[in-house]
Interface confidence: medium
């Protein structure tokens, strides 16, 4: 799997999970989240050569097409596969609220 | 929806469905498929600016991060959303076989 266990231990030019820490205030301009101040969002990046973690039959076809066809601008892209939620604390007035924001943390990637 | 109805009628630099015809023999080197000779596979391409058909909360976060940090390489990518199967005819010896290959045709796109 193209997850932290594999990607963070290997120098990998191909599609893989990349570390990314996001500071809510600095990076997103969000001032409403009290805790945490930021989180390890991660992201997916890298090339998608033929059969590198292809998600669907279409992405396999596309990467093969990309190998054979000289134009090759139609290629699969490295995107998130498994995502996890993030629990946040914010305030409405003086009332603290705890909420789970779904699909905030990328855990693994795929070529789609 | 970023489908043919919208994308094929508009000149759109952002993430959209693009027409792509694939000839099995010429483009993939596949000689085993008897019919059809090729098909309209389509593909997804284009930029993913903030809130342009974002798939998940993470992709929304990423595109906002990318807007505030323009030098960042962490940005969402335009990929397939809805896919359809393709029915093919091939032969095992002299015996014709009809099979449905899943996820072969892209019908719409998203920023993920």
């Amino acid at each position: 799997a193209l997850d932290a266990a594999y990607c963070f231990r290997n120098v990998q030019d191909n599609c893989c999970l990349r570390p990314l820490y996001i500071d809510f205030k600095r990076d997103l301009g969000w001032k409403w989240i009290h805790e945490p101040k930021g989180y390890n969002a991660n992201f997916c990046a890298g090339a998608c050569p033929y059969l590198w973690s292809s998600d669907t039959q279409h992405s396999r076809v596309l990467s093969l097409y990309n190998t054979i066809n000289p134009e090759a601008s139609a290629s699969p892209c490295c995107v998130s596969q498994d995502l996890e939620p993030l629990t946040i604390l914010y305030y409405i007035g003086k009332t603290p609220k705890i909420e789970q924001l779904s699909n905030m943390i990328v855990k693994s990637c795929k070529c789609s | 929806a970023l489908d043919a109805a919208y994308c094929f009628r508009n000149v759109q630099d952002n993430c959209c469905l693009r027409p792509l015809y694939i000839d099995f023999k010429r483009d993939l080197g596949w000689k085993w498929i008897h019919e059809p000779k090729g098909y309209n596979a389509n593909f997804c391409a284009g930029a993913c600016p903030y809130l342009w058909s974002s798939d998940t909360q993470h992709s929304r976060v990423l595109s906002l991060y990318n807007t505030i940090n323009p030098e960042a390489s962490a940005s969402p990518c335009c990929v397939s959303q809805d896919l359809e199967p393709l029915t093919i005819l091939y032969y095992i010896g002299k015996t014709p076989k009809i099979e449905q290959l899943s996820n072969m045709i892209v019908k719409s796109c998203k920023c993920s």
């Epitope: 090339a47 134009e71 | 792509l20 010429r26």
Partner: antibody
Framework: EQQLVESGGGLVQPGGSLRLSCAVS????????VNWVRQAPGKGLEWIGY???????YYASWANGRFTISKDSAKNSVYLQMNSLRAEDTAVYFC???????????????????WGPGTLVTVSS | EAVLTQSPGTLSLSPGERATLSCQSS????????LSWFQQKPGQPPRLLIY???TLTSGVPDRFSGSGSGTDFTLTISRLEPEDFAVYYC????????????FGGGTKVEIK
Amino acid sequence: EQQLVESGGGLVQPGGSLRLSCAVSGFSLSSYTVNWVRQAPGKGLEWIGYISYGGSAYYASWANGRFTISKDSAKNSVYLQMNSLRAEDTAVYFCARHMQVGGAPTGSMAAFDPWGPGTLVTVSS
Amino acid sequence: EAVLTQSPGTLSLSPGERATLSCQSSQSVYNNNYLSWFQQKPGQPPRLLIYGASTLTSGVPDRFSGSGSGTDFTLTISRLEPEDFAVYYCAGGYSGSSDKYAFGGGTKVEIK
């Protein structure tokens, strides 16, 4: 208007490195493939490689290993990193976009248009 | 690795005459028509004249025409104008994971 402009050329010693930039305007690098082509003084054109809209780079066999193409779509720039430079790498370096035909980035049939004006790289001691 | 051979190396003609330039590929270009023609004048980048072996680029005068398929291609200038004296290059697109493009050595069309 759709434009490409190269920069970063100059004099470099044999064995040295250089990074050329190709700044694009009027179109998105997320939708188009950009090529690098070079031309030695008084000689013909030579294809180096390209980077596709999706970020996949392809190279001529002679360029593989020494030359690396990358891009920063947010900065509207494509780069050509050249290492272990030799005298025979002296040339004008052009970036050129795949022309778009029929509403899709594919099917341009080896058509490069538009081109940048080029930047001269001289490898000499 | 494909090699494109252009002939003649130099063509000496007078304005008003017909010019016929040849481009021969050591292997078939992709789809038999991934062949372009470029015009280059001193100190300028190449200018695309014809793509897909025979399709004239927008703004190019119709005295230019291209023909051929597979491995043999021709660029014809029906009546040479003073501004047509330049160097002409053909470029081919090829299948495979490397050397997707190649340029011919060029033909110089000079005033007799």
